[in-house]
Interface confidence: low
């Protein structure tokens, strides 16, 4: 599969920054999502978790952008082996954790 360019990762990071900075009410009405293992396959795992949140316009662009980094089709209810067993967190916390990790990847030049 083609390697995602640094610009795509930068845009994803910028979108996550926008979400965290513009958050007024609880993000996605406080919806809970599965926590994921951030060490490998982070894009698909993040999408598999966030795709189960519906009706939340604030993260729709993030969901769409993550689709661009995940080479396989991801459907709601699909659970990755990278999911942290039986641990759910709020979408807001999930986004913050993902943002910190993606910033680290960007600094290290890991765009795939």
């Amino acid at each position: 599969s083609p390697v995602p360019p640094s610009t795509a990762l930068k845009e994803l990071i910028e979108e996550l920054v926008n979400i965290t900075q513009n958050q007024k009410a609880p993000l996605c009405n406080g919806s809970m999502v599965w926590s994921i293992n951030l060490t490998a396959g982070v894009y698909c795992a993040a999408l598999e978790s966030l795709i189960n949140v519906s009706g939340c316009s604030a993260i729709e662009k993030t969901q769409r952008m993550l689709n661009g980094f995940c080479p396989h089709k991801v459907s709601a209810g699909q659970f990755s082996s990278l999911r942290v067993r039986d641990t759910k967190i709020e979408v807001a916390q999930f986004v913050k954790d993902l943002l910190v990790h993606l910033k680290k990847l960007f600094r290290e030049g890991q765009f795939n």
Epitope: P4, G68, K73
Partner: antibody
Framework: EVQLLESGGGLVQPGGSLRLSCAAS????????GSWVRQAPGKGLEWVSA????????YYADSVKGRFTISRDNSKNTLYLQMNSLRAEDTAVYYC????????????????WGQGTTVTVSS | SYELTQPPSVSVSPGQTASITCSGD??????SFWFQQKPGQSPVLVIY???KRPSGIPERFSGSNSGDTATLTISGTQAMDEADYYC?????????FGTGTKVTVL
């Protein structure tokens, strides 16, 4: 406004060559994937070739492999299709297409199309 | 090579529902896309990722995809929906378009 403008079509004899160009405006082509899709007179759509948004990978339909070459000039914000050894069956309207937002071009829809340029291969 | 098969034509009365099918081996495991093309015009994306509508596409267009079949549904069909419709999927480093369906609004 995002727009694609194709040029370079025309009448060519069998065995001849043509180079199609697709100038993009309203966005930077280098950040996106691009495809060429053709449609023979009265027929359906046929995908021809794609250039990945991650800058390098190229893909071709079996019907044109070895004869057509897709390329991109980022400085000119333009996508190209070099067509060699043309055959009568290559006669079609050729559309330039922007492939969505993703670096993996196969995950996004072909959401911006040019108006098409006509290629006629005939003696 | 991978093939996507559509019915050549579908007829529908104004205000009724038109359903167009697209069949391919394990198509449900892939993303499906749908395009509308009116005579003399370039195709327009109406559904991506099986069931999502791009901005500007009316809500009457919806899609689904499971098993071997993707379906485009036009609810409350209008005269302006008369066009050719093509499904599309990605398989083994190539895009594949369906054979196309002409929708006629009676």
């Amino acid at each position: 406004e995002v727009q694609l403008l194709e040029s370079g079509g025309g009448l060519v004899q069998p065995g001849g060559s043509l180079r199609l160009s697709c100038a993009a405006s309203g966005f930077t082509f280098s950040s996106y994937a691009g495809s060429w899709v053709r449609q023979a007179p009265g027929k359906g759509l046929e995908w021809v070739s794609a250039f990945s948004g991650s800058g390098g990978s190229t893909y071709y339909a079996d019907s044109v492999k070895g004869r057509f070459t897709i390329s991109r000039d980022n400085s000119k914000n333009t996508l190209y299709l070099q067509m060699n050894s043309l055959r009568a069956e290559d006669t079609a309207v050729y559309y330039c297409v922007q492939d969505g937002l993703g670096p993996y071009f196969y995950n996004y829809g072909m959401d911006v199309w040019g108006q098409g340029t006509t290629v006629t291969v005939s003696s | 090579s991978y093939e996507l098969t559509q019915p050549p034509s579908v007829s529908v009365s104004p205000g009724q529902t038109a359903s167009i099918t697209c069949s391919g081996d394990k198509l449900g495991d892939k993303y499906s896309f749908w395009f509308q093309q009116k005579p003399g015009q370039s195709p327009v994306l109406v559904i991506y990722h099986d069931s999502k509508r791009p901005s500007g596409i009316p809500e009457r267009f919806s899609g689904s995809n499971s098993g071997d079949t993707a379906t485009l549904t036009i609810s409350g069909t209008q005269a302006m929906d008369e066009a050719d419709y093509y499904c599309q999927a990605w398989d083994s480093s190539t895009y594949v378009f369906g054979t196309g369906t002409k929708v006629t609004v009676l």
